[in-house]
Structures are given as structure tokens and as C-alpha cells.
């Protein structure tokens, strides 16, 4: 279970034509 | 101006622990991502692990998963790694390096001086 | 098992053109980043989504990445650019892959 203190971070995967691009990354979201 | 520094490496028999810091200074260390890279001599690069803006969002390469954990204190903007279990494949030097910044943080902008740890009995 | 190979050793006179590639299964598909690192010291980020620099990186090292090849291109080499450079790129949350490295001469 996430941490409260964590709730508002963006988390941060790896996923193709996420972030606004094309390609495959890394992709940080709140 | 931005800068990062490693310490805490040293010689350690095989079996026991080391645990490394990172002092980041110049920049917002909570905003950042932060990984560790290893580097045996005369060898390549090879990433170690990552630990994302939350505590919780972190990753480790196959080769330590078990044995090593990152973690990081935004109060002091210090970046750990806690080297349990070592071993001789382990001996490289360390550095560690900057995520960029933004939403699609795919590369390693700013690294340290790096600190040698040797693995041998 | 991915893996991205690079050439070994890459030789270039001044003022030439020199190229090092990075191969690796549908690299293309991933975002490659390039990095330099001088005798000695810590590795330095040249290029990083294919194609862009840092600020701070002369406008002579380019890249691109397309099929299972990414390119660092040097135009122009000077002495200062001999070094070693590694591609990056991630296949993973948890696999960030790393060339073997090419060493640069400029003879």
C-alpha cells in the first residue's frame, strides 16, 4: 500500500506512446 | 552550480554489507529521480536501480534485487544504497546520477565523481 | 535477454566524420540516449532522445535511432572528443540497458 506522504508524487513506469510520445520510456504521472 | 557526491566505499569481505551516500546539491533533490550505476574496471556501465519522487516508486536491476536497496532523504538530499549480501561481481566503482527532469525522464543528466567499492577477502 | 552492442573501437582523423553505432532488438521503438566519458572521469550525457543535446553539447555531436540501430554522429572531430561512448535505453521499469562502450581515437 502507498504511503500516505506519497499520495501526490507522480509515479514513474515504463510504457510505449504514453507522455506524449511515440516511442517506448520511462513516463512519470500523478 | 549542480553537483553530486558519493562516499562511503571502501574494501569489504564477501557476505557483508556497505552502504553508500550521495550528496546532491545546486538543485530541487525532491523533484528529481535518482538512480545508481555501477561500473567494474576497465568494464562498462550498468545500471543498478532507481528510486522515482515517492518512496515507494522504486526499481533494481535483476543482478542486486534482494540484496540492495535504494532509498533517499529529501530533508538532507542524500541518496542511499544498502549493499547487503556483496560479492565479488559487486566490486566496480558507483556512481550516482540524475534523472532529467520532467514527465518523460528516459536519460541520466548529471552523475558524481563516483566512489570505489572493492568486494574481497 | 535483450543486449546492445556497439563496436569495439572506432578510429576517425581530426576534422573527419566519425560514427558509432548502437544495435539491439527494435531499439527503434525505444528512446536512445548517448554518453561520454574521458579517461578517467564521470560519464557526461551528449544526446538523449535520439536526436537531442543538452545545452552545453557542441552542435557537432548529433544522433538518430530507427529499425535496431541508434547513431551518435561526431562531425568535425577534435582531439577532445576521444573517449568513450555508451548508448542507453530502457527495455523496462527495471532493465535500462547499456552498450559495451566504443572507444573513440582520433588520430
Known amino acids: 500500500r502507498r504511503r500516505r506522504r506519497d499520495t501526490h508524487f507522480p509515479i514513474c513506469i515504463f510504457c510505449c506512446g504514453c507522455c506524449h510520445r511515440s516511442k517506448c520510456g520511462m513516463c512519470c504521472k500523478t | 552550480q549542480v553537483q553530486l557526491v558519493e562516499s562511503g566505499g571502501g574494501v569489504v569481505q564477501p557476505g557483508r554489507s556497505l552502504r553508500l551516500s550521495c550528496a546532491a546539491s545546486?538543485?530541487?533533490?525532491?523533484?528529481?529521480?535518482m538512480h545508481w550505476v555501477r561500473q567494474a574496471p576497465g568494464k562498462g556501465l550498468e545500471w543498478v536501480a532507481v528510486?522515482?519522487?515517492?518512496?515507494?516508486?522504486?526499481y533494481y536491476a535483476d543482478s542486486v534485487k534482494g540484496r540492495f536497496t535504494i532509498s533517499r532523504d529529501n530533508s538532507k538530499n542524500t541518496l542511499y544504497l544498502q549493499m547487503n549480501s556483496l560479492r565479488a561481481e559487486d566490486t566496480a566503482v558507483y556512481y550516482c546520477?540524475?534523472?532529467?527532469?520532467?514527465?518523460?525522464?528516459?536519460?541520466?543528466?548529471?552523475w558524481g565523481q563516483g566512489t570505489m567499492v572493492t568486494v574481497s577477502s | 535477454c535483450y543486449e546492445l552492442t556497439q563496436p569495439p573501437s572506432v578510429s576517425v582523423s581530426p576534422g573527419q566524420t566519425a560514427t558509432i553505432t548502437c544495435s539491439g532488438d527494435k531499439l527503434g521503438e525505444r528512446y536512445a540516449s548517448w554518453y561520454q566519458q574521458r579517461p578517467g572521469q564521470s560519464p557526461v550525457l551528449v544526446i538523449y532522445q535520439d536526436i537531442k543535446r543538452p545545452s552545453g553539447i557542441p552542435e557537432r555531436f548529433s544522433g538518430s535511432n530507427s529499425g535496431n540501430t541508434a547513431t551518435l554522429t561526431i562531425s568535425g572531430t577534435q582531439a577532445m572528443d576521444e573517449a568513450d561512448y555508451f548508448c542507453?535505453?530502457?527495455?523496462?521499469?527495471?532493465?535500462?540497458?547499456f552498450g559495451g562502450g566504443t572507444k573513440l581515437t582520433v588520430l
Open positions: 528510486i522515482w519522487y515517492a518512496e515507494s516508486n522504486k
Open positions: 545546486g538543485f530541487t533533490f525532491s523533484s528529481y529521480g
Open positions: 542507453q535505453a530502457w527495455y523496462s521499469s527495471t532493465n535500462v540497458l
Open positions: 546520477a540524475r534523472a532529467q527532469e520532467g514527465i518523460a525522464p528516459d536519460a541520466f543528466d548529471i
